[in-house]
Interface confidence: low
Amino acid sequence: QDEDFKASDDLTSISPEKRFKVSISGTEVVVTCPDVFGYDNIKWEKNDNLVEGASNRELSQKEFSEVDDSGYYACYADSIKEKSYLYLRARVCANCIEVNL
Amino acid sequence: FKVSVEELEDRVFLSCNTSVLRIEGTMGIQLPHSRTLDLGKRILDPRGIYRCNATEEQSDKAPYMQVYYRMCQNCVELNSAT
């Protein structure tokens, strides 16, 4: 039953620059805004609230909390009104690695 | 026209005021007589890109929603001896 739900590795139907990149290492989570906005001044929102002090394509959280920091993320450029949206839920741990079974 | 993500017990559901379009990623199952897509158990790390179904003239109001779960089911804790 659950085989139906496995994530597809064949993500070909949208160009890569339109995707968020999520990198997780230990307790650090880095979310990279899609490239569609170029390198303009980027604004980030989390659950519809502006993330103060975040203006790069990368939003980094050194001590990500699954409870507090999971949710809706949006990024957009000052010059473009269109937003890109990400729903992220991540469980992190300081001294662990993810093994591919 | 924004996709909303809901968790009910251990499953992940996407819903729209119209229906949910899968652009790529986890297939999910469209619930009958509903505007909801069941992405399955969250421990299977559903991931993909989705948007609400909209008419041609409204499509710019239906942004993409990327979904990314990482529930660490295959995480191995390292101790100092490892």
């Epitope: 409870v67 507090d68 741990c93 | 009910l8 499953r11 529930m71």
Partner: antibody, heavy 118, light 108 residues
Framework: ELTLQESGPGLVKPSQTLSLTCVVS?????????WNWIRQRPGRGLEWMGY?????IYNPTFQGRISITADTAKSQFSLQLRSMTTEDTAMYFC?????????????WGQGTLVTVSS | SYVLTQLPSKNVTLKQPAHITCGGD??????VHWYQQKLGQAPVMIIY???SRPTGIPERFSGANSGNTATLTISGALAEDEADYYC???????????FGGGTHLTVL
């Protein structure tokens, strides 16, 4: 319907180790959820102690003398609290987050009263 | 670590609205959950994520959260609402769940 049931000794001597177990029915103990221990001293408020979710996180108040483990095959998780003092006399609850309420405690056991006395 | 402040007790007249507050530094940026605990019973979650109500919780219970204060409102308090009420958040810096000290509501 998910139910949680605590069990353990009602009386513990000072300096001993408290061992409590929470048996889960109507569901299984898996790493998908946070499985918590919370206590309430007489006439006081609620105090979160820690959780198990494959790995563990503990309230710094108890760091060094607390251990939470799980036996997924038996669908139960346990609390060990070492070096008990009379200040540890409390009602001990096990609890789990809700599917839609991450970080909140949607399911609770009825609690088990632990008295520390010689 | 993060501190949540609640008034120890509050009185409300039967069928009148009751407002129970929970103070914390920039609490508006956190998810606040509320619990009701009746004498000799386990707590029951009555509000989660600031204002969401679990199935089976009466509509008279509602929640709001902004700035430095979260508020639980009972639109018309009934005798059965006499209980202790606790707010709770997750303190991500301390990696710990934090409860307020609780407010005992008496319905007169």
């Amino acid at each position: 319907e998910l139910t949680l049931q605590e069990s353990g000794p009602g009386l513990v001597k000072p300096s001993q180790t408290l061992s409590l177990t929470c048996v889960v029915s109507g569901g299984s103990v898996t790493r998908s959820y946070y499985w918590n221990w919370i206590r309430q001293r007489p006439g006081r408020g609620l105090e979160w102690m820690g959780y198990w979710t494959g790995s563990t996180i503990y309230n710094p108040t108890f760091q060094g003398r607390i251990s939470i483990t799980a036996d997924t095959a038996k669908s139960q998780f346990s609390l060990q609290l070492r070096s008990m003092t009379t200040e540890d006399t409390a009602m001990y609850f096990c609890a789990r987050e809700g599917g839609k309420s991450l970080g909140a405690f949607a399911y609770w056991g009825q609690g088990t009263l632990v008295t520390v006395s010689s | 670590s993060y501190v949540l402040t609640q008034l120890p007790s509050k009185n409300v007249t039967l069928k009148q609205p009751a407002h129970i507050t929970c103070g914390g530094d920039k609490i508006g940026s956190k998810n606040v959950h509320w619990y009701q605990q009746k004498l000799g019973q386990a707590p029951v979650m009555i509000i989660y994520y600031d204002s969401s109500r679990p199935t089976g919780i009466p509509e008279r219970f509602s929640g709001a959260n902004s700035g430095n204060t979260a508020t639980l409102t009972i639109s018309g308090a009934l005798a059965e609402d006499e209980a202790d009420y606790y707010c709770q958040v997750w303190d991500s810096s301390a990696k710990a769940a934090v409860f307020g000290g609780g407010t005992h509501l008496t319905v007169l």
